[in-house]
């Protein structure tokens, strides 16, 4: 067990802070919830603290919760490939470019680290080149989320990882909006981190609303499990 992994043996409180600017539309989002890495489970509620969110909530899911991949469940035989927990408590910087097909792009930079006993994800997001009447600024996405695989590989030069995946957002007319994600994670501290073999995270997310909440918001339940590396031969013959 890495030193960082010991911080995730129980339920951990999570705070998320996002400041965004998409085509000049500025907004802030505040998130609170809990993570339980034993089950790869996240429960979070996000509130737009500046009024109405100028983009659809589903376009921010990867920035919020795929941001705290340290809560992913890594099976016992894969624990030596868990970069995310090994970087804690000092944390990691997570940078992404997200290309929305036939539309604009988001660039995000986040610092994910422990502050006291709380895991904090602080994010800056800049979006450019979006069509005002497109699927994103035109709010044409359905309020739901598909399952995805998130592919991880080591980046030895930067002592971190590179991550690629493609999100499929459902559009109200029955078609799909693709969002290509290019991600890089580097540790904040200078302690040792685990550099993984290639593998993937399998994610399942459910979006809902709080019937008592008047503010623009999103409630998220998510399960994430690492996969893609088989047991060694010695395991098979036990």
């Amino acid at each position: 067990m890495s030193k960082g992994e010991e911080l995730f043996t129980g339920v951990v409180p999570i705070l998320v802070e996002l400041d965004g600017d998409v085509n000049g539309h500025k907004f802030s989002v505040s998130g609170e919830g809990e993570g339980d890495a034993t089950y790869g489970k996240l429960t979070l509620k996000f509130i737009c603290t500046t009024g109405k969110l100028p983009v659809p909530w589903p376009t921010l899911v990867t920035t919020f919760s795929y941001g705290v991949q340290c809560f992913s469940r890594y099976p016992d035989h894969m624990k030596q490939h868990d970069f995310f927990k090994s970087a804690m408590p000092e944390g990691y910087v997570q940078e992404r470019t997200i290309f929305f097909k036939d539309d604009g792009n988001y660039k995000t930079r986040a610092e994910v680290k422990f502050e006291g006993d709380t895991l904090v994800n602080r994010i800056e997001l800049k979006g450019i080149d979006f069509k005002e009447d497109g699927n994103i600024l035109g709010h044409k996405l359905e309020y739901n989320y598909n399952s995805h695989n998130v592919y991880i590989m080591a980046d030895k030069q930067k002592n971190g990882i590179k991550v690629n995946f493609k999100i499929r957002h459902n559009i109200e007319d029955g078609s799909v909006q693709l969002a290509d994600h290019y991600q890089q994670n580097t540790p904040i501290g200078d302690g040792p981190v685990l550099l993984p073999d290639n593998h993937y995270l399998s994610t399942q997310s459910a979006l809902s609303k709080d019937p008592n909440e008047k503010r623009d918001h999103m409630v998220l339940l998510e399960f994430v499990t690492a996969a893609g590396i088989t047991h060694g031969m010695d395991e098979l013959y036990k």
Epitope: P13, S30, E32, E34, T43, T49
Partner: nanobody, 121 residues
Framework: QVQLVESGGGLVQAGAALRLSCAAS????????MGWFRQAPGKEREFVVS????????AYADSVKGRFTISRDNAKNTAYLQMNSLKPEDTAVYYC???????????????WGQGTQVTVS
């Protein structure tokens, strides 16, 4: 996600006492700062009192200091508001609130209950 349900409201005469309860579910209660807000007819919702995660720190609005007491029982996932020497101006809907952040007197908690009516005649 955290859900809050208030109880204990009602109609009382001036000078009487009431105890409100706020039962929390769906989260780890001991993680959250808890508090009470109130909204009188035709007025904005206002801060009444808050209590820290451990129960060690409290903050009160000047209008209720010395009369209201907040407490919590982390084993029962419940927060309480003991209201003594009630006045007609305490009449309002009382809302329980919770949040990981320390929202203080000015901030906005993340989670709210539906409220319970307190009427002082």
């Amino acid at each position: 996600q955290v859900q809050l349900v208030e109880s204990g409201g009602g109609l009382v005469q001036a000078g009487a006492a009431l105890r409100l309860s706020c039962a929390a579910s769906g989260g780890t209660f001991s993680f959250y700062n808890m508090g009470w807000f109130r909204q009188a007819p035709g007025k904005e919702r206002e801060f009444v009192v808050s209590i820290s995660r451990s129960g060690g720190g409290t903050a009160y609005a000047d209008s209720v200091k010395g009369r209201f007491t907040i407490s919590r029982d982390n084993a029962k996932n419940t927060a309480y508001l003991q209201m003594n020497s009630l006045k007609p101006e305490d009449t309002a809907v009382y809302y329980c609130a919770a949040g990981l952040r320390d929202w203080g007197r000015e901030g906005e908690p993340h989670y709210w209950g539906q409220g319970t009516q307190v009427t002082v005649s």
